[in-house]
């Protein structure tokens, strides 16, 4: 299953939208920085596209869930959020099409499950951080920066997979 070229463009648009969502000067938020422990190895160790697609799907689904909460709606510009949802939704559809085609169904399911669980735990840590920080503007900015970084790392993986094949 080859992800369409539009998927790459969508990933870039998603990052652009995340950058545009900024609401406050970030320099005042340095003290709120936090180590969320992005499970980078779960993306780096998947050598076959078949193994990465469910993990990438989980990543985007979790981003969608995180920014779909009422707390998120209160934190960000509604127009930008709507565009952001649309981009994420399209990427989920692209990835689901590959999953439905049965890519990797018989290949190392346990490894995939472990990776998916690691991604879920990562987002649990992010959610807990926001809760502890009472969804402050700075906390949201730290999370936005973290999502930009982790999303960028995961989309770089997609690009390297595409170039390998």
């Amino acid at each position: 299953c080859d992800l369409p070229q539009t998927h790459s463009l969508g990933s870039r648009r998603t990052l652009m939208l995340l950058a545009q969502m900024r609401r406050i000067s970030l320099f005042s938020c340095l003290k709120d920085r936090h180590d969320f422990g992005f499970p980078q190895e779960e993306f780096g160790n998947q050598f076959q596209k078949a193994e990465t697609i469910p993990v990438l799907h989980e990543m985007i689904q979790q981003i969608f869930n995180l920014f779909s909460t009422k707390d998120s709606s209160a934190a960000w510009d509604e127009t930008l959020l709507d565009k952001f949802y649309t981009e994420l939704y399209q990427q989920l559809n692209d990835l689901e099409a590959c999953v439905i085609q049965g890519v990797g169904v018989t290949e190392t399911p346990l490894m995939k499950e472990d990776s998916i669980l690691a991604v879920r735990k990562y987002f649990q840590r992010i959610t807990l951080y926001l809760k502890e920080k009472k969804y402050s503007p700075c906390a949201w900015e730290v999370v936005r920066a973290e999502i930009m970084r982790s999303f960028s790392l995961s989309t770089n993986l997609q690009e390297s997979l595409r170039s390998k094949e």
């Epitope: 950058a19 970030l26 005042s28 340095l30 003290k31 920085r33 920066a145 973290e146 970084r149």
Partner: antibody, heavy 121, light 107 residues
């Protein structure tokens, strides 16, 4: 390979203007902030200010606010430090350095080689 | 502004010595403290970030500890290439501030 390359040494007269540069390569320029640090002859490091090249938002040390201007041109991955009217006391080595912003990553992990600015009549 | 105070301002030591430099912040900065090494005519080099994390490529004889207001840089066994000036720097809030430096000289 990550690199920050600064413009060459400058010799200026008091009252003249100056703009020095710091060009980033080997990484996504807009994903990191660029900080500027002054070191006067035989003295320690002084933080001057910082810029987020993604949108040119800046923060200055109160000591340098109004004395210098920090800017960036993301299309050419370059940050700038400028003076509208130099003073003899601006004579120093100026360094740029990369900062990860709000990400949990090493601060000022890469530095430029420095630009020596000499102001003398 | 947060003031950073290093001590001592200079010290003399021999190769193989254990060297300790301290840095005190005027208010709590959690773990947002970095250590840099600078040699004459060169740009500073990051050694330790977030108080105790060793920067990639830095020898393991360098270590950092502390949180809140009191921090320490330790060189477990001083090597000839370690004679330099060391600076602490807080990244808890702007303006970011450096300590005044500690010069490590040969005894």
């Amino acid at each position: 390979e990550v690199q920050l390359v600064q413009s060459g040494a400058e010799v200026k007269k008091p009252g003249e203007s100056l703009k020095i540069s710091c060009k980033g390569s080997g990484y996504s320029f807009t994903s990191y902030w660029i900080g500027w640090v002054r070191q006067m002859p035989g003295k320690g490091l002084e933080w001057m200010g910082i810029i987020d090249p993604s949108d040119s938002d800046t923060a200055y040390s109160p000591s340098f606010q109004g004395q210098v201007t920090i800017s960036a041109d993301k299309s050419i991955s370059t940050a700038y430090l400028q003076w509208s009217s130099l003073k003899a006391s601006d004579t120093a080595m100026y360094y740029c350095a990369r900062h990860p912003g709000l990400n949990w990553a090493p601060d000022f992990d890469y530095w430029g080689q420095g630009t020596l600015v000499t102001v003398s009549s | 502004d947060i003031q950073m105070t290093q001590s001592p301002s200079s010290l003399s030591a021999s190769v193989g010595d254990r060297v300790t430099i301290t840095c005190r912040a005027s208010q709590s900065i959690n773990e947002f403290l970095n250590w840099y090494q600078q040699k004459p005519g060169k740009a500073p080099k990051l050694l330790i970030y977030f108080a105790s994390s060793l920067q990639s490529g830095v020898p393991s004889r360098f270590s950092g500890s502390g949180s809140g207001t009191d921090f320490t840089l330790t060189i477990s066994s001083l090597q000839p290439e370690d004679f330099a000036t060391y600076y602490c720097q807080q990244s808890y809030s702007t303006p970011l501030t450096f300590g005044q430096g500690t010069k490590v000289e040969i005894k």
